[in-house]
Amino acid sequence: TLNSVLINSNAIKNLPPPLGGAGGQPGSAVSVAPGVLYEGGNKYQTLDNYQPYPCAEDEECGSDEYCSSPSRGAAGVGGVQICLACRKRRKRCMRHAMCCPGNYCKNGICMPSDHSHFPRGEIEESIIENLGNDHNAAAGDGYPRRTTLTSKIYHTKGQEGSVCLRSSDCAAGLCCARHFWSKICKPVLKEGQVCTKHKRKGSHGLEIFQRCYCGEGLACRIQKDHHQASNSSRLHTCQRH
């Protein structure tokens, strides 16, 4: 089937849209196949056999990662970007996606947020003037980059099922994930819902139908009662930190 080839596909950046936003109920027995509506891209870094995960935008990385060139100087070398570990509280940042979940980028520093202050992917307004030479702003990946919050602030955010290009296009509680024909807004995963955790072992394929990432305070971890299962079929669910 179409979905079965993606595991070995070398097409990492430009797969079609996201996973259908039907959103499974917590604890529902959802198939782990890449074709499920409850999917989304949780690409967490694993220490075993870690390899950089190529990306074109933040939404292709896990919720604890952001997409960037490995070093500022590397931006010109083919414009290669990979998923990098998010920056913790009080670390320097240039946009919200660089900060770890529960934080947002304020005046160039990752600050704690009581609620989800800004959607992933938006650029923090007060530092826009510093982004002229940002390597992400000129990634050349075919996706338009938003350069100011005000351009979007008066527009209605996409509801579930709305086509999007990044999670900042979607309403609160939704992320922009692939659903084959296009990326669409889908519900961020709740506790107990099946999530996708990618081990980086060489060849990677972006799912045709993605799940969103786990919501705030949750991590995509192996389900306790699935420890006996084979490595390839272990079921991951969103669990409290």
Epitope: T1, L2, N3, A11, N14, L15, P16, P17, G20, G21, A22, G23, G24, V30, S31, G35, V36, L37, Y38, G142, Y143, P144, E160, G161, V163, L165, H179, F180, W181, S182, I184, I208, F209
Partner: antibody
Framework: QVQLLQSAAEVKKPGESLKISCKGS????????LHWVRQAPGQGLEWMGW????????NYAQNFQGRVTMTRDTSISAAYMELSSLRSDDTAVYYC?????WGRGTTVTVSS | QSVLTQPPSASGAPGQRVTISCTGS?????????VHWYQQLPGAAPKLLIY???NRPSGVPDRFSGSKSGTSASLAITGLQAEDEADYYC???????????FGTGTKVTVLG
């Protein structure tokens, strides 16, 4: 394997309504969106809209708004597309698709 | 009246290379939305040929390749074979129409 089984061909008169079905099997039906696409004889493909099989939410193409209704019954893994006020130019093959898999199509003829 | 324009026809002798263009605008292909290609054999439902601009699903020969640049996309068929004779459609999303759109379609004829 994934299959989308569509209802049989229909002949309708102008002004009547049409309701065709699409039954999914071999996958988790509520987990996907289903789209309807039609193709008039000798013409290209035209997207009509989608339905979220889990929530029932719909989104219709501008050309069909007010005339099309998409529903689903998750208990039998089926989706339905109803088109009202039929005209002769609605004569077409109507496909349901899960985006990566397509039904074989339902031929609809509208003639007086 | 499709917003994605394709040449009506293309042809080539067996073994030759044929390229089909799909021209859009800044509200569809140029906006960053993916392009997919379908092959439709006579009397059959569309079959996915290329997804996400340049990716081939399993079972599709590597003679088929897709690319995207700016506001247009193209499908290339190298080593043309008799069984490639079919209609080919590109597809994307259009933000100004808030809907999915298909190209006008291209009929590929294998000569000789």
């Amino acid at each position: 394997q994934v299959q989308l089984l569509q209802s049989a061909a229909e002949v309708k008169k102008p002004g009547e309504s049409l309701k065709i079905s699409c039954k999914g099997s071999g996958y988790d039906f509520p987990g996907y969106y289903l789209h309807w696409v039609r193709q008039a004889p000798g013409q290209g493909l035209e997207w009509m809209g989608w339905i979220n099989a889990n929530s029932g939410a719909t989104n219709y193409a501008q050309n069909f708004q007010g005339r099309v209704t998409m529903t689903r019954d998750t208990s039998i893994s089926a989706a339905y597309m109803e088109l009202s006020s039929l005209r002769s130019d609605d004569t077409a093959v109507y496909y349901c698709t899960r985006e990566d898999h397509w039904g074989r199509g339902t031929t609809v003829t509208v003639s007086s | 009246q499709s917003v994605l324009t394709q040449p009506p026809s293309a042809s080539g002798a067996p073994g030759q290379r044929v390229t089909i263009s799909c021209t859009g605008s800044s509200s569809n292909i140029g906006a960053g939305y993916d392009v997919h290609w379908y092959q439709q054999l006579p009397g059959a439902a569309p079959k996915l040929l290329i997804y996400g601009n340049s990716n081939r699903p399993s079972g599709v020969p590597d003679r088929f390749s897709g690319s995207k640049s700016g506001t247009s996309a193209s499908l290339a068929i190298t080593g043309l074979q008799a069984e490639d004779e079919a209609d080919y459609y590109c597809q994307s999303y259009d933000s100004s129409l808030s809907g999915y759109v298909f190209g006008t379609g291209t009929k590929v004829t294998v000569l000789g």
